[in-house]
C-alpha cells in the first residue's frame, strides 16, 4: 500500500557538521512513502506493530520508535515503610499453651493488651503504624513481634525511617526498664523483663529513583539522570527543558544519541548555525559572524 505524507523539510546540521533533514508537517510538498511487506520491520528498537501503529518500548517513541524520549516516567511509592523484628519478655502474664493458638480467647486478649501497651509506648512517633505479634513462647511470655513504621516518600525517607527505628529502640528499652514487677506484682498495664528486650532485624523499603531511571533508560542509562521538583523525582535526559541539567541548544534541536545529547543546528534562509550548543550564527549573504 502507498501512504501519502505531506511534509516540508527543515535542514538541520548536527554539531559534528553533518546535515540532517527532519520533516515538519506542511501541505505544500506531498511526498509518497512506500510501505511494503511486513509492518514489523517498520518498528525499530524492539517496538511492535499493533495493526495501526508502532507500539514502542521505553525509552523510545515516534512513528518507527526511532526517537528517544526526553523524560521517562518513574513512580516512587506514595509511602515507604520499615519493619522491626523485636522480642520482649512480658512478666505480668503467666504463659499457657493456649497463647500459641492465634484464634484462642487467650491470644486475642493478650494481643489486645499488648497492642494497647505498645501504642502507648510509641505514641510520640509519627511514623508508627502498629505492632504485629508473630509468636508467643514460654518464659514468662516471650513476645516476638514486628513494629511497623510508615512515612510519605521523600528523597530523605531513609533518614526519616532510620531515625524512627532509633526512637523505637529507645522507647522500648525505656519501658522495659521502668515497667518491671515489684514484689511479684505489676502495677502497670504490662510488666517486662529488662534483659529480654532485643532488636532482631530491621527491614526498610528499598526504593532508588536513580536505579529505576537507569533501568528504564536501558542503553541510554549513562545520559539520563534524576532531578527533583517538589520532592518528586524526574528521570530526564539533557534534552528535557526546564531542569538544571537541561542542555540549551539555542538555534537548534536537542537529540539523544547513544553518545549522549547533541544539538542539531538549524539552517534558516538567512543564517546557518554551528557550535556544540548551536550558538554560533553565520549570516548567509555577508558571511558575517556574530554571537
Amino acid at each position: 500500500p502507498l501512504a501519502t505524507i505531506p511534509v516540508s523539510t527543515t535542514s538541520l546540521t548536527s554539531s559534528e557538521g553533518s546535515t540532517i533533514s527532519t520533516p515538519s508537517v506542511d501541505i505544500s510538498t506531498p511526498v509518497t512513502t512506500s510501505i511494503v511487506g511486513d509492518q514489523c520491520s517498520r518498528c525499530k528498537n524492539g517496538g511492535f506493530w499493533d495493526g495501526l501503529k508502532c507500539q514502542c518500548l521505553t525509552p523510545y517513541y515516534g512513528e518507527s520508535c526511532e526517537e528517544v524520549v526526553n523524560s521517562i516516567d518513574i513512580a516512587p511509592p506514595e509511602t515507604v515503610s520499615a519493619q522491626m523484628e523485636l522480642t520482649v519478655t512480658v512478666t505480668s502474664v503467666k504463659f499457657t499453651d493456649e497463647l500459641k493458638n492465634h484464634s484462642s480467647q487467650e491470644f486475642r486478649e493478650f494481643n489486645k493488651t499488648f497492642t494497647e501497651q505498645m501504642n502507648i509506648v510509641y505514641s510520640g512517633i509519627p511514623e508508627y503504624v502498629g505492632v504485629n505479634i508473630t509468636n508467643l513462647r514460654l518464659g514468662s511470655v516471650v513476645v516476638e513481634h514486628d513494629v511497623l513504621l510508615r512515612t510519605k516518600y521523600t528523597p530523605e525517607y531513609k533518614t526519616a525511617l532510620d531515625n524512627a527505628t532509633e526512637v523505637v529502640k529507645q522507647k522500648i528499652t525505656k519501658v522495659t526498664t521502668e515497667q518491671i514487677m515489684t514484689n511479684d506484682n505489676c502495677s502497670a498495664l504490662m510488666c517486662f523483663n529488662t534483659t529480654g528486650t532485643q532488636v532482631q532485624n530491621i527491614t526498610v523499603t528499598q526504593y532508588d529513583p536513580v536505579e529505576e531511571c537507569r533501568q528504564k533508560a536501558e542503553e541510554y542509562e549513562d545520559y539520563f539522570l534524576v532531578e527533583y521538583r517538589d520532592q518528586k523525582p524526574y528521570c530526564i535526559s539533557p534534552c528535557e527543558s526546564g531542569f538544571n541539567a537541561s542542555k540549551n541548544c539555542n538555534h537548534g534541536k536537542c537529540q539523544m544519541s547513544q553518545n549522549g545529547a547533541r544539538c542539531l543546528c538549524v539552517t534558516t534562509e538567512t543564517h546557518w548555525y554551528s557550535g556544540e550548543d548551536c550558538n554560533q550564527g553565520t549570516q548567509k549573504s555577508h558571511h558575517h559572524h556574530h554571537h
Partner: nanobody, 124 residues
C-alpha cells in the same frame, strides 16, 4: 464474650462480715484470672485481691491481708470475697473483674472484663 454478675453488697457495722459473689460465664477454658477491685467516693479504683482459677496464685492488697479471703468455685464458675473485720475505710463500690490470661497485675486497665459494682457500706 465473658459476662460477670456481682452480688452480696450491703450495709454492715464495723467489725462485721459480708460475702460477695461474682458469677462468670463465657469462658472457653477453666484456667483464668479473677479479681476484686473497689472504688471509694472520690478515689481511684484499686485492687483488693485476685486469684488464678487453677489455684496457682492469690494476691491480697496490704490493707485487707488477714481480713479478706478470695476464693473460686470451679464447678459454679463463681468468685467469692469473704470480708471479715470490716472497717469504715472498706466502704466502697466493689467490682469483680476477669481475664482469660493468668495475670499478675494490679492495674485495673489490664483487666478486660468487668461486672457491675455492688455497694458495701461499713457504718455504725
Amino acid at each position: 464474650d465473658v459476662q460477670l454478675q456481682a452480688s452480696g453488697g450491703g450495709v454492715v457495722q464495723p467489725g462485721g462480715s459480708l460475702r460477695l459473689s461474682c458469677a462468670a460465664s463465657g469462658y472457653t477454658s477453666n484456667r483464668y484470672s479473677m479479681a476484686w477491685f473497689r472504688q471509694a467516693p472520690g478515689k481511684e479504683r484499686e485492687v483488693v485481691a485476685f486469684i488464678w482459677t487453677d489455684g496457682g496464685r492469690t494476691y491480697y492488697a496490704d490493707s485487707v491481708k488477714g481480713r479478706f479471703t478470695i476464693s473460686h468455685d470451679n464447678s459454679k464458675n463463681t468468685l467469692y470475697l469473704q470480708m471479715n473485720s470490716l472497717r469504715a475505710e472498706d466502704t466502697a463500690v466493689y467490682y469483680c473483674a476477669a481475664s482469660s490470661l493468668l495475670l499478675q497485675t494490679i492495674n485495673p486497665r489490664a483487666w478486660p472484663y468487668w461486672g457491675q459494682g455492688t455497694m458495701v457500706t461499713v457504718s455504725s
